[in-house]
Amino acid sequence: KSPIFGPQEVSSIEGDSVSITCYYPDTSVNRHTRKYWCRQGASGMCTTLISSNGYLSKEYSGRANLINFPENNTFVINIEQLTQDDTGSYKCGLGTSNRGLSFDVSLEVSQVPELPSDTHVYTKDIGRNVTIECPFKRENAPSKKSLCKKTNQSCELVIDSTEKVNPSYIGRAKLFMKGTDLTVFYVNISHLTHNDAGLYICQAGEGPSADKKNVDLQVLAPEPELLYKDLRSSVTFECDLGREVANEAKYLCRMNKETCDVIINTLGKRDPDFEGRILITPKDDNGRFSVLITGLRKEDAGHYQCGAHSSGLPQEGWPIQTWQLFVNEESTIPNRRSVVKGVTGGSVAIACPYNPKESSSLKYWCRWEGDGNGHCPVLVGTQAQVQEEYEGRLALFDQPGNGTYTVILNQLTTEDAGFYWCLTNGDSRWRTTIELQVAEATREPNLEVTPQNATAVLGETFTVSCHYPCKFYSQEKYWCKWSNKGCHILPSHDEGARQSSVSCDQSSQLVSMTLNPVSKEDEGWYWCGVKQGQTYGETTAIYIAVEERTRGSSHVNPTDANARAKVALEEEVVDSSISEKENKAIPNPGPFANEREIQNVGDQAQENRASGDAGSADGQSRSSSSKHHHHHH
């Protein structure tokens, strides 16, 4: 007996589709060998129609595919637009030839069953409504009109013109006439369910002179759309339910046995398993909306359904749309840490992957916010200025070509904890989610800058030093000047690296930056950081204030300039939250607060590359003028 298993008999009707699953034993060879589907001829020959090597016969062109699921030890043959010519004997199998391991499948495609010749067929989706047209002769105008549903023995009343209504149609069925036309009546049935499918008879009058019409009502469950996504990538469920449910709450749920568990809805419900990686976005007033899930996991695979109902929960008789999501474990998206840990006052460097084929795409970093339907306002991007409340402590370093960009956030507080998304204006599958956890610091930071009260005097020389521990000895140290376009690395040489590597004196490890002579443009945030090649590590930040020399004093040291900078920053946070509220007032904002900006620059990625120094790790540009001498003391 064959170790391959599948359905021995498959029966369907013309125009429909089949999805045949074949099961194979769990071995590495089986998972990787060729899979095929062939048709057996009278001679015993089996002619390949489709195989996993990419072969597709002419008769299957545009209507069939074969998908291998190595993690389930199955492969699936999907065939659409069936005709009676597809009836026959087939084999699904494994091996380089069609004489390998195989399983016999018989496929029978029948004609669509014949109905009485005068039958009118109405085909509707679940949850929709149907209006059945019932013509009659003028002499039956005064008579009773009715619609009944055929059962085995009788015809069960649905509704009649005397306002009798079957209990299962109360509130759903209406019998009416239009205008002055006395030759047609109509029956509208709303919130259709599977149980409404069947044969109906509408009738006007009684006895032999009655007008009758046969109606076949077909109520279809939506065919699930198949979605194939990579592990760690993202998926968007585009749900279009129609104008009639535009004002109802929307939901996405996942089938679980006989229930459908809501994952997210527009009433604020959200499954904790999707915290930080899901958004629901109302698209327009026509009942369209979308749900975006990032950071796909193996366990996210399954049968999803979207719908609309005032409760935000699935209800029978309301329109739905369905998908079958498959998550491919052989992913092109690199496996990165999904949780990054930092401490208060410290910093984190987050490596964001992007499709290496799209190195010129614009890169962004946004913070996922779960309130309402969820949204992800952009905090920084290659052409998006840093949000004001992140001034001096957030920068994006683009490293063109290597499939990674880095986002650095320093001066961490516990309020920074949360979920962040890496995204580009290119391949949307590469959206990834990072959870940032911030713990209270229990020790001194690794990098410390002196002096901490950094006020430089115009025209004079000013030096700041960055102390680092021996564990950073072999790493590259750098200073950069922060602007809301990035942190421009200043050229420096670290003389500490020339010392004997045998010993390391904790107290003397420092890299200094000197401004000589100090100018007004030097005022601002500076970062001291470490990195190894293109991999960024810790950073610390200092605000350098620039003041004019006061008479009678060669050096003024006012109260902590950084404290002043921080006060200003807190004021900015208040302002920015106000402007964000204004932003939220825009009708139907997208999931990203700066989405319009992303879309607008989307097509200009080539022409408008960020100008060299905005976050360029190796650009020696404008702030490296001759007045800056960087040396180690």
């Epitope: 369907s12 429909d16 006989e258």
Partner: nanobody
Framework: EVQLVESGGGLVQAGDSLRLSCAAS????????MGWFRQAPGKEREFVTT??????????YYADSVKGRFTISRDNAKNTAYLQMNSLKPDDTAVYYC?????????????????WGQGTQVTVSS
């Protein structure tokens, strides 16, 4: 919940036929497949046959031991599955269980089924 009730079991001679019925009630619209398993005394429950459906399309799966002798069918309107057993052998003696599933990854695996009937005894004497 879905309730399943089997009927049609009994004592027959080898070579005879028997027809089992499995009537489903409750939230049957959520079911996607119905099948039959059997369990002989002292043995594990084994797969016999399953029918799954999607719209007008039906898929029928059979164990090698019953292929060509047993036929599964269903009446959608009655929410009932049938097992027509021909050319019965003494080896077919067992309690036959009806099972229903909302999602089936592998029809041969009993744990894939969500609902089970109480079982009906089939005895084939030689």
């Amino acid at each position: 919940e879905v309730q399943l009730v089997e009927s049609g079991g009994g004592l027959v001679q080898a070579g005879d036929s028997l027809r089992l019925s499995c009537a489903a009630s409750g939230r049957t619209r959520t079911t996607y497949g119905m099948g039959w398993f059997r369990q002989a005394p002292g043995k594990e429950r084994e797969f016999v046959t399953t029918i799954t459906w999607s719209g007008p399309t039906n898929y029928k799966y059979y164990a090698d031991s019953v292929k060509g002798r047993f036929t599964i069918s269903r009446d959608n309107a009655k929410n009932t599955a049938y097992l027509q057993m021909n050319s019965l052998k003494p080896d077919d003696t067992a309690v036959y269980y009806c099972a229903a599933s909302t999602v089936l990854t592998d029809p041969r695996v009993p744990t894939e089924y969500d609902y089970w009937g109480q079982g009906t005894q089939v005895t084939v004497s030689s």
